[in-house]
Interface confidence: low
């Protein structure tokens, strides 16, 4: 607020005044006396930078005009009553009412008094953020877009992620006249380790009180990423039984196992069950190339393990056998 | 439903005065603004002149200053024109309108004629 | 004062017909100017508010448009019920002006 003046009349008002798009706002200007002062107010005048003609007068006869009644109101201005508060409210706010304004007092002996006030419209955004699914490419691709919608000045967005990535931001008119909506794309080439991993979309806008944190959970499809454990190229003769398992990761998640050998179906002493192949005690040797073949819905993928099931020393106890 | 209810046709030498009432319902008296037209036979509209119920406060056609009081009666939610010192060109059909910068409702109209 | 003159003062015009009714204020009234329709022994009903704003209830047929000094009033497509005369008003400043009004007929 500018400091009163001293030894003279000076209208009081904010420099700066916001409102939000469809709300009301109150333009506040009041016209300061000083104690030892005299002064006459005759009319209270708002005109609006570059329009012709007031869009408000309070006449201390005829009381208030307004250029439209509808939307405009003196908050305290009355017939009859000294004018010192020329407040000025204003309904329905429209991005159009953005702008400099000049309240101003006709004043006797001082004659007229005035000052400017900027109205700043602003609209609150609302913001959304969502997962983009995306398949494996080789290219970055959207991965996570994040959208604020109907800000008023547009919102700034930012996003936040240990993966790297890069961010493509831009603009279009929002709803409302005036209004902006921001959409930004988070740019990654997928990968099956960035699977379900989180990118954080921050929003700022000067009507928030502090940002808006949006997490995104990324979602990358692709095919089973396959690798058999259980073997630890220590099989034996007498050894008890031992189990593969079959290791996929996939999203979607894996439809189907397959256990085959490199010479086609699996042999008597390997039993399929699921991800699992369970490998019977054998009384002889081997040396067998396993195959686990997975699908999903994005295809088939497969890992192979060669197995040898050596005799051992006479005084070892490890090895597959019957019992 | 608003409602802006006037009184009935006048007939009125030159010199004499009218006073005609316009009882409203259906909305808060005080809060808007009633105003008042007239129109004379096959011919535009000309404002008159408002008055605020709640302050008092008038608003008039210079053309009419002088020879037209508006005035209220808050109890009964009911406006008046009284228009003085009148003359053959005052014959009109006299609107009081509720004020919404334009005006969203009027009254049914009142006839005056100032006839000798 | 402000003077709103309004061309025609009379038109005819046939069922279907667009009509278009002008206003031109004799200074600036940036939008504020009211439209309304007068039926033979009735009262005015307020049609357009603010230039363009058509009050609730009314056919969306009337439309308004203009600032500053020119302004229209368009009925897209006539109907019988609309013979009426039109006023234009301006609320810009005191005293409160019409227009002279425009007489429509129907053929």
């Known amino acids: 607020w500018p400091p009163p003046g001293t030894g003279d009349v000076v209208v009081q008002a904010p420099t700066q005044v916001p409102g939000f798009l469809g709300d009301s706002v109150t333009l506040p200007c009041y016209l300061q006396v000083p104690n030892m002062e005299v002064t006459h107010v005759s009319q209270l005048t708002w005109a609006r930078h570059g329009e012709s003609g007031s869009m408000a007068v309070f006449h201390q006869t005829q009381g208030p005009s307004y250029s439209e009644s509808k939307r405009l109101e003196f908050v305290a201005a009355r017939l009859g009553a000294e004018l010192r508060n020329a407040s000025l409210r204003m309904f329905g706010l429209r991005v159009e009412d953005e702008g400099n304004y000049t309240c101003l007092f006709v004043t006797f002996p001082q004659g007229s008094r005035s000052v400017d006030i900027w109205l700043r419209v602003l609209a609150k955004p609302q913001n959304t953020a969502e997962v983009q699914k995306v398949q494996l490419t080789g290219e970055p691709v959207p991965m996570a877009r994040c959208v604020s919608t109907g800000g008023r000045p547009p919102a700034q967005i930012t996003w936040h992620s240990d993966l790297g990535g890069m961010p493509n931001t831009s603009q279009v008119p929002g709803f409302l006249s005036g209004t902006v909506t921001v959409t930004s794309l988070w740019i990654l080439v997928p990968s099956s380790q960035v699977d379900g991993k989180n990118v954080t979309c921050k929003v700022e806008h000067e009507s928030f009180e502090k940002p808006q944190l949006l997490t995104v959970n990324l979602t990358v499809y692709y095919p089973p990423e396959v690798s058999i454990s259980g073997y630890d190229n220590n099989w034996y003769l007498g050894q008890n039984e031992a189990t593969l398992t079959c290791d996929a990761r996939s999203n979607p998640e894996p439809t189907g196992y397959n256990w085959s050998t490199t010479m086609g179906p699996l042999p008597p002493f390997a039993v399929a069950q699921g991800a699992q192949l369970l490998i019977r005690p054998v009384d002889k040797p081997i040396n067998t190339t396993l195959i686990c073949n997975v699908t999903n819905a994005l295809g088939a993928r497969q890992a192979e393990l060669t197995v040898q099931v050596k005799e051992g020393p006479p005084s070892e106890h490890s090895g597959i056998s019957r019992n | 439903e608003v409602q802006l209810v006037q009184s009935g046709s006048e007939l009125k030498k030159p010199g004499a005065s009218v006073k005609i009432s316009c009882k409203t319902s259906?909305?808060?008296?005080?809060?808007?603004?009633m105003h008042w037209v007239r129109q004379p036979h096959g011919k535009g509209l000309e404002w008159i002149g408002g008055?605020?119920?709640?302050?008092?406060?008038?608003s008039y056609n210079q053309r009419f200053k002088g020879r037209v009081t508006l005035t209220v009666d808050k109890s009964t939610s009911t406006a008046y024109m009284e228009l003085s010192s009148l003359r053959s060109e005052d014959t009109a059909v006299y609107y009081c309108a509720r004020w919404t910068g334009d005006f969203d409702y009027w009254g049914q109209g009142t006839l005056v004629t100032v006839s000798s | 004062d402000i003077q709103m003159t309004q061309s025609p003062s009379a038109m005819s015009a046939s069922v279907g017909d667009r009509v278009t009714i002008t206003c031109k204020a004799s200074?600036?009234?940036?939008?504020?100017v009211a439209w309304y329709q007068q039926k033979p022994g009735q009262p005015p009903k307020a049609l357009i508010y603010s230039a363009s704003y058509r009050y609730s209830g009314v056919p969306d047929r009337f439309s308004g448009s203009g600032s500053g000094t020119d302004f229209t009033l368009t009925i897209s497509s006539l109907q019988a019920e609309d013979l009426a005369e039109y006023f234009c008003?301006?609320?810009?400043?005191?005293?409160?002006?019409f227009g002279q009004g425009t007489k429509l007929e129907i053929k």
């Open positions: 200074q600036n009234v940036g939008t504020n």
């Open positions: 008003q301006q609320y810009q400043s005191y005293p409160y002006t």
């Open positions: 008055i605020h119920p709640n302050s008092g406060g008038t």
């Open positions: 259906g909305y808060t008296f005080t809060e808007y603004t």
